[in-house]
């Protein structure tokens, strides 16, 4: 039956997650080559990230460890260029990297991509120096963007019996203290699998150990109020669990939020099929769990973040992971995480090499960013339940929240339901008693051009969505619906629906 | 093929009653809002009323609320329109339409009935 | 009196591009909700031409378009031909009256 009844449970909310839920993540394999970071520069970019605030801007990744500030590095000629363009105005309203530089940092781009995948797929990876001025364009991209900066520090820097040498993290507090920048902090990138990486072993208590070390360096310095989060581990498999257990009783106390990562498919192999397929998105649910009852049974009450996330490791699944079809997997981690408990879900990666990307190679913005913005717009921090009646529940994914009380068209007491049809046929969506004569707005999204699934191009409500120029993103155009219409989600889509004038108690 | 024929037209008194009867075939009703829309003789198109696929609303033109009912009858596969207390002005063509998506989420009307001639005079 | 403003009449040569306006309010086409457009050729019940602002159904030749701003909709004819001669109706919802209103009509004489 296309005609589908849903279920409300809109007494209370389940959890309340971060006004910054929706984060990004920039790889710190863009620091590779530090001349590539002045790319954070483009106005374009900004205004893009500027449009998931507030967000976290998450800097880290495999290369986190692999990374050494070096204070006494000078600027390379790009950051040069970039900062003498920015001299004697506000670099936030006005800074822009000077043409010939993005140009030339622009046709290198594709060959240093290739560069960092190689590495990646290889396992081989090298140490790399950044300078002050690199830590200073990645700061300025996150304060001008309205991103609170997290920074992941280098944790294979080890003395002689496996201790975590903290001198060269002490360098970079000591700049940035200098500087006045506010700094949220992590220690090591996926420790699990630092035996694969660099052939040293680290047991989750001797993490722990390293993070209390790294704690009583912040409360020395200007920056006793900083956060600091981990211990980013890959997805809790046996050995992967046991690790973060272990680490949590060890160092646990000093950390504000649990951070683990979560992959659904190894991008050199994943399919369409894969992302389309109910199976793969209710494995998400088993990783969440796992990761929940090792929180749960060590620290309970911690919050627990996706520090990293995306569609498929390894940079993501060639023509996929940047479509209209990596949505279905977006949306309903986003969905699953909030109805989980997951306070906030940061995505890999906001700009950078590989697939995933939110934003591309050319600063133009790509479905998932577009889906990205709706949902910062539309989706409230209150999370409340949304079901389908009956059995066949699995392709069709409903989620419910409280509105963005943010949103000037919205107030208090609405609703936002976001849905995914996995199904090949239009599902008809009926609202239960009271909402079902309600005013309801819908945000419908849908692949432009002969591509489908697979375009790199979306409409909201059959309007392309595209920037109006470098700094002004387009409005968001709400379609109403006939109070008492079902609401109507197209094969293969997803869709936002804020049910206006709901006045329900707990969103007030 | 899909088809609405109406029925029910004819010569009545201001005042009196008549009741229209829409039969539709071709397709599931049960899943589709239907609305009446009349046209005046030598003028433009106004919308009547309306009915949800269930029956669960119904919505009318201020110039008839009050006086004229639309109900349909799943189980026959027809829609009704009860016109009470009839004026001269509601002299028109009654057309009975569908909506172009099922369960009332579309208010385009894609296939419409032939019309039925009501005529309203002393 | 409408709710939906159309110009009576519009005209055109074969072969010629035409547009008929459709003018609402913030209750209606102004608030973004859906704008369809009728074809009635003389004697016949009318026929949908457009909906959803600019969708075409099958069957509907890609001479016709609809578009839509603010509080305002077009319907456009390419390449007019004789058999266009018709009146032509938009249609929205409106959400102060809770139901579909229509445009007075537009009469199309192809020259």
């Known amino acids: 039956q296309d005609v589908v009844d849903l279920d409300f449970f809109t007494q209370e909310p389940l959890h309340l997650v971060s006004p910054s839920f929706l984060s990004v993540t920039i790889d710190a394999n863009l620091a590779t080559d530090p001349r590539f970071l002045i790319l954070l520069g483009s106005p374009k970019l900004r205004t893009l990230a500027r449009g998931l605030s507030p967000a976290y801007l998450r800097f880290g990744g495999t290369k986190t460890d692999f990374l050494i500030f070096d204070p006494k590095k000078e600027s390379t000629f790009e950051e040069r260029s970039y900062w003498q363009s920015q001299v004697n105005q506000d670099i936030c309203k006005y800074g822009s990297i000077p043409p010939d530089v993005e140009e030339k940092l622009r046709l290198e781009w594709p060959y240093q991509e290739q560069l960092l995948l190689r590495e990646h797929y290889q396992k081989k990876f090298k140490n790399s120096t950044y300078s002050r001025s690199s830590v200073d364009v990645l700061y300025t991209f996150a304060n001008c963007s309205g991103l609170d900066l997290i920074f992941g520090l280098n944790a294979l820097l080890r003395t002689a019996d496996l201790q975590w040498n903290s001198s060269n993290a002490q360098l970079l507090l000591d700049y940035c203290s200098s500087k006045g920048y506010n700094i949220s902090w992590e220690l090591g990138n996926e420790p699990n699998s630092f035996l694969k990486k660099a052939d040293i072993f680290i047991n989750g208590s001797q993490l722990g150990e390293d993070f209390i070390q790294l704690h009583k360096l912040l409360r020395k310095s200007t920056f006793k109020n900083a956060k600091l989060y981990g211990p980013d581990v890959g997805q809790p498999r046996r050995k992967t669990a046991k690790m973060l257990k272990s680490f949590l009783k060890a160092g646990g106390e000093v950390i504000d939020s649990v951070t683990w990562h979560h992959y659904y498919l190894n991008g050199r192999t994943a399919t369409k099929e894969d992302f389309l397929n109910p199976d793969v998105l209710d494995i998400f649910i088993s990783s969440v769990q796992k990761v929940f009852q090792v929180v749960e049974s060590t620290r309970p009450g911690k919050k627990v973040w996706l520090g990293e996330t995306s569609s498929a490791y390894g940079g993501g699944a060639p023509l996929l992971s940047d479509t209209f079809a990596a949505g279905f997997m977006w949306l309903d981690k986003l969905g699953l995480s909030a109805r989980m408990g997951i306070e906030v879900v940061m995505r890999q990666v906001f700009f950078g090499a590989g697939n995933y990307h939110l934003v591309d190679e050319n600063f133009d913005p790509l479905p998932d960013y577009w889906l990205s913005l709706l949902f910062k717009k539309l989706v409230g921090t209150k999370v409340l339940m949304a079901s389908v009646q009956g059995s066949k529940r699995r392709k069709l994914r409903v989620y419910l929240h409280c509105t963005n009380t943010d949103n000037p068209r919205y107030k208090e007491g609405d609703l936002t339901l976001y849905a995914i049809n996995l199904h090949n046929v239009t599902k008809y969506l009926r609202l239960p008693y009271p909402f079902s004569n309600k005013q309801v707005d819908k945000y419908l999204l849908r692949p432009l051009g002969p591509h489908g699934l697979l375009s790199k191009s979306v409409q909201l409500n059959g309007l392309t969505l595209k920037m109006v120029d470098d700094q002004t993103l387009p409005p968001l155009m709400e379609k109403p619906l006939r109070p008492g219409s079902s609401l109507g989600l197209p094969a293969f889509s997803y869709s936002f629906f804020v049910i206006r004038n709901a006045k329900v108690a707990a969103c007030i | 093929q899909v088809q609405l024929v109406e029925s029910g037209g004819g010569v009545v008194q201001p005042g009196r009653s008549l009741r229209l009867s829409c039969a539709a075939s071709?397709?599931?009703?049960?899943?589709?809002?239907m609305h009446w829309v009349r046209q005046a003789p030598g003028k433009g198109l106004e919308w009547v009323a309306v009915?949800?696929?269930?029956?669960?609303?119904?919505y009318y033109a201020d110039s008839v609320k009050g006086r004229f009912t639309i109900s349909r009858d799943n189980s026959k596969n027809t829609l009704y329109l009860q016109m009470n207390s009839l004026r001269a002005e509601d002299t028109a063509v009654y057309y009975c339409?569908?909506?172009?998506?099922?369960?009332?989420?579309?208010?385009?009307?894609?296939?419409w009935g032939q019309g039925t001639m009501v005529t309203v005079s002393s | 009196q409408s709710v939906l403003t159309q110009p009576p009449s519009v005209s055109g040569a074969p072969g010629q591009r035409v547009t008929i306006s459709c003018t609402g309010s913030?209750?209606?086409?102004?608030?973004?909700?859906?704008v369809h457009w009728y074809q009635q050729l003389p004697g016949t019940a009318p026929k949908l031409l457009i909906y959803?602002?600019?969708n075409r159904p099958s069957g509907v030749p890609d001479r016709f378009s609809g578009s839509k701003s603010g509080t305002s909709a077009s319907l456009a004819i390419t390449g007019l031909q004789a058999e266009d001669e018709a009146d032509y109706y938009c249609?929205?919802?409106?959400?102060?009256?809770?139901?579909?209103?229509f445009g007075g009509g537009t009469k199309l004489t192809v020259l």
């Open positions: 071709g397709f599931t009703f049960s899943s589709y809002g």
């Open positions: 339409a569908r909506e172009g998506a099922p369960y009332s989420s579309s208010d385009a009307f894609d296939i």
């Open positions: 249609q929205s919802y409106d959400s102060s009256l809770s139901g579909s209103v």
């Open positions: 009915i949800w696929y269930d029956g669960s609303n119904k």
């Open positions: 959803g602002d600019n």
């Open positions: 913030s209750s209606n086409i102004g608030a973004n909700y859906d």
